[in-house]
């Protein structure tokens, strides 16, 4: 796609004024840039900046969406992009709440089938290739605002109207309560709130912790799993290696995680996905006569 | 359904400048790039650049850069380019297009659908 | 800037026939490719775009294939109303740019 896009755009997010604020949050600096008499002041952090073309990237995925998807074609994409940007724009980035994504999660709810939701942990590519492939499965990358936001980076500046495009807040070296952590727990918390039935995780296999506490799944969507609705949480480890044959629901990690999900009154599956290649392959096409087997 | 509806056909002459206009109708306007696309006798199509009304944000290509302004008016669904200096190897038919999204892991891919019916731009002397 | 060569420039066909219209990448684009038909004096439209996907209310008798660096447009049965001018378009990098043409005529 068009990542590597002209430095020539016309495209101005700075009409805001430019103050300095003596409040630090987290372990940001603040550095002068621009030159001049009068410096202009920057608040500097440890992760990335902002997507380069971020609001223009917000509103055609936004457009896209509503176009493929016609329950959602009453939605305004002008209103979704005032919304978005009105949830992080002129505040400072390690202050944003649930509360500022309010107005964004208004306009952007969607009914899902609450019983063909997809969770995933540190297995993202497979658990969307499996949906493109099942398509009356959900992971949250498949509704409109886990579609926005994926992979996508942004942040404001306190009291300016700017975009920052050199570096925003990194949940763990400066804050957690910034605009991109905030949303995605904001979303999450939602999107598991919702769910019913038999609820799917896919987790990887090839990872020290298959089951982290400290992963959106783990500190988010498990606690927020209605016991009153979600009959069952069945997880699918997937295998890394061609040749590992062992039985990856027996991992300390878990048992970890059937105990918290036992705890909440929801009864609690695993299966070993041995091949994921092949798996997507079956899923494709169930008639394959080698996919009577174990995968 | 989206129509685009351009403006007539000119004739300038050589160093003088030419405002297209293409109005929309039936869609959302303002949340959709309009582009630029001009076809010269016996050459290629040839993408200008576009407009995203929403923000009001223009992106030239390079060898354009400097003699193209696109504009929009949201109150009247109506975009336009303007094409400063003319000369004679300006002359081609000038098309407005909506741009489609397609797919593309991080920003969709750019088609045009629909075009205008384009504006043929006449520069002699 | 990413350069489309459009082959063969012309393409004699009757109707019935199959039609293969050939777009080349100067570099590989993936999947980031369109296909347009103009017939004279109209403006391009829309035939396939992301390198296989039929645009809304072509025939099926147009498809599309390739990535990378290759791709093809196939009419798989020519109509009257098919011989036209087409033209490819790549999506993958800026500035956006488009092929030669490749001009189906009537044998």
């Known amino acids: 796609g068009l990542n590597d896009i002209f430095e020539a755009q016309k495209i101005e997010w700075h009409e805001g004024s430019h103050h300095h604020h003596h409040h630090h949050h987290g372990s940001g600096s603040l550095v002068p840039r621009g030159s001049g008499s009068v410096p202009r002041w920057r608040q500097q952090w440890s992760g990335p900046g902002t997507t380069k073309r971020f609001p223009e990237t917000v509103l055609a995925r936004c457009v896209k969406y509503t176009e493929i998807h016609p329950e959602m074609r009453h939605v305004d994409c002008q209103s979704v992009w005032d919304a978005f940007k009105g949830a992080f724009i002129s505040k400072h980035p390690c202050n944003i709440t649930e509360e500022d994504y309010q107005p964004l999660m208004k306009l952007g709810t969607q009914t899902v089938p609450c019983n063909k939701i997809l969770l995933w942990s540190r297995i993202k590519d497979l658990a969307h290739q499996f949906t493109q492939v099942q398509r009356d499965m959900f992971t949250l990358e498949d509704t409109l605002l886990g579609y926005l936001a994926d992979d996508l980076t942004w942040c404001g500046e306190f009291n300016t109207s700017k975009i920052n495009y050199q570096s925003c807040p990194d949940w763990r070296k400066d804050c957690s309560n910034n605009p991109v952590s905030v949303f995605w727990k904001t979303v999450s918390r939602r999107f598991a709130e919702a769910a019913c039935d038999v609820v799917h995780v896919m987790l990887n296999g090839s990872r020290s912790k298959i089951f982290d506490k400290n992963s959106t799944f783990g500190s988010v969507e498990v606690h927020n799993l209605q016991p009153e609705k979600v009959q069952t949480l069945e997880a699918w480890v997937i295998h890394g290696g061609r040749e590992d044959s062992r039985d990856l629901c027996q991992d300390p990690t878990i048992k970890e995680l059937e105990s918290i999900i036992s705890k909440r009154n929801i009864q609690f599956s695993c299966k070993n996905i041995y091949r994921p290649d092949k798996f997507l392959q079956c899923v494709k096409n169930p008639e394959d006569s080698s996919c009577t087997s174990e995968i | 359904q989206v129509q685009l509806v351009q403006s007539g056909a000119e004739v300038k002459k050589p160093g003088s400048s030419v405002k297209v206009s293409c109005k929309a109708s039936g869609g959302n306007f303002i949340s959709y790039s309009i582009s630029w696309v001009r076809q010269a006798p016996g050459k290629r199509l040839e993408w200008m650049g576009w407009i995203i009304p929403i923000f009001g944000t223009t992106t030239y290509v390079q060898k354009f850069q400097g003699r193209v302004t696109i504009t929009a008016d949201e109150s009247t669904s109506t975009a336009y380019m303007e094409l400063s200096s003319l000369r004679s190897e300006d002359t081609a038919v000038y098309y407005c297009a909506r741009v489609k999204y397609g797919s593309g892991s991080y920003y969709p891919n750019n088609w045009f659908d629909p075009w205008g019916q384009g504006t043929l731009v006449t520069v002699s002397s | 800037e990413i350069v489309l060569t459009q082959s063969p420039a012309t393409l004699s066909a009757s109707p019935g026939e199959r039609a293969t219209l050939s777009c080349r990448a100067s570099?590989?684009?993936?999947?980031?490719l369109a296909w347009y038909q103009q017939k004279p004096g109209q403006a391009p439209r829309l035939l396939i775009q992301?390198?296989?996907t039929r645009a809304t209310g072509i025939p099926a008798r147009f498809s599309g294939s390739g990535s990378g660096t290759e791709f093809t447009l196939t009419i798989s049965s020519l109509q009257s109303e098919d011989f036209a001018v087409y033209y490819c378009?790549?999506?993958?990098?800026?500035?956006?740019?488009f092929g030669g043409g490749t001009k189906v005529d009537i044998k």
């Open positions: 378009q790549q999506s993958d990098n800026w500035p956006l740019t």
């Open positions: 992301d390198s296989s």
């Open positions: 570099q590989s684009i993936s999947s980031n």
